[in-house]
Amino acid sequence: VPRWRQQWSGPGTTKRFPETVLARCVKYTEIHPEMRHVDCQSVWDAFKGAFISKHPCNITEEDYQPLMKLGTQTVPCNKILLWSRIKDLAHQFTQVQRDMFTLEDTLLGYLADDLTWCGEFNTSKINYQSCPDWRKDCSNNPVSVFWKTVSRRFAEAACDVVHVMLNGSRSKIFDKNSTFGSVEVHNLQPEKVQTLEAWVIHGGREDSRDLCQDPTIKELESIISKRNIQFSCKNIYRPDKFLQCVKNPEDSSCTSEI
């Protein structure tokens, strides 16, 4: 008799999830000498232990603590790049500007980037059919709680000038409900962080509006200022030229605004 299985609204666990996590861990520790001590099998066991046999709507940050401990990593706290709704460009940037780091440039972020996972209460099975959707089902699901946990820790570690890349093409350039707006902003430490500098990325077409004057950016400035952190903002009018100038800063065309 086939066992009844909970149907969730979101996509199921990414196929070959255990193999993918393990392979990513091995690859990451090979590339990053400072993480060579990490035992990837233990990392997978801790990852699995966070959600296997647990109800996928009842996951807590506590469930991920063993994984967090194993994945502890020191990144230069003054070289942190946060992002919201513009992941690809942020990652292209840190691939060129190698001394800056997004969350996905850390071991734990790298392991989970673009993956989905969940288990089932009281069975050791991974659910490849469906997983809870944050909006339609529940917010305390394995994926959301993971990103909330690692994002909080990443923001807490930041110091000096923290940069954030924001998508100027969206109706809400700063969205209070995004991970950046709901987690990272509130976990920057005022005693360590001097300034949050926003880079507002214009979309496929430059326009002459100063998107730093957008009401949602003013809202971000207000939240940050109330936390005794300074705020600054720059328009990136041409993301293609911006990346080009990061690669070749001595290029003569890189003296003008980008």
């Epitope: 496929g204 077409r205 430059e206 326009d207 002459s208 509006r209 100063d210 328009n235 009018y237 041409r238 003008s256 605004e257 980008i258």
Partner: antibody, heavy 114, light 110 residues
């Protein structure tokens, strides 16, 4: 916005047209140059944005140069040919949810003839 | 390169009638709505009638209506008046800050 500088020139003699703006700032507005040959339709040449970045129609690259000061936008016809005979307009480009050329000058006539 | 095509070079209708001018783009305009409409009369500056595909410009009578999205757009002029006799152009804005104009449609009011 108002264009000036249109006149009769011989082929190959560079010519600069000027668009003078008032009532708004070029630091947060884009200006486009558009031309219209006698009896023909409108043709977009290129634009300059608040940032100073310039963009050109494929056919116009190398043939025209757009630049600006705080209150003027220039269009240089680098090496005019008879095909460049037209009325040249400058227009302000609206942004975001109000995209369009919302303010036009009366135009300035350029005649290229030997 | 992006091409804007206004299929009819001329349309005519009687006073009080309706004319429809179409504008087709070879590729989607930016955000599917970077399309505007203009009226040109001899000896007068060009006038923007519709911006962002469907928004009526200030001071333009509601008889003018813009519609469409992506690659297909229409300007409809209803309750035609003799003063509406003019040439009408569409203009499109594309990704990468490229713009273009349609070939124009002359409206003749009988």
């Amino acid at each position: 916005v108002e264009e000036s500088g249109g006149r009769l020139v011989t082929p190959g003699t560079p010519l600069t047209l000027t668009c003078t703006v008032s009532g708004f700032s070029l630091s947060n507005n884009a200006i486009s140059w558009v031309r219209q040959a006698p009896g023909k339709g409108l043709q977009w040449i290129g634009s300059i944005y608040g940032s100073g970045n310039t963009y050109y129609a494929t056919w116009a690259k190398g043939r025209f140069t757009v630049s600006k000061t705080s209150t003027t936008v220039d269009l240089k016809i680098n090496s005019p040919t008879t095909e460049d005979t037209a009325t040249y307009f400058c227009a302000r480009e609206g942004a975001g949810s109000s995209w369009g050329f919302n303010l036009w000058g009366p135009g300035t006539l350029v005649t290229v003839s030997s | 390169a992006q091409v804007l095509t206004q299929t009819a070079s001329s349309v005519s209708a009687a006073v009080g009638g309706t004319v429809t001018i179409s504008c087709q783009s070879s590729e989607s305009v930016y955000k599917n709505n970077y399309l505007s409409w203009y009226q040109q009369k001899p000896g007068q500056p060009l006038k923007c009638l519709i911006y962002s595909a469907s928004t009526l410009a200030s001071g333009v009578p509601s008889r003018f209506k813009g519609s469409g999205s992506g690659t297909q757009f229409t300007l409809t002029i209803s309750d035609l008046e003799s003063d509406d006799a003019a040439t009408y152009y569409c203009a499109g804005g594309y990704s990468g800050n490229i713009n273009g104009f349609g070939g124009g449609t002359e409206v003749v009011v009988k």
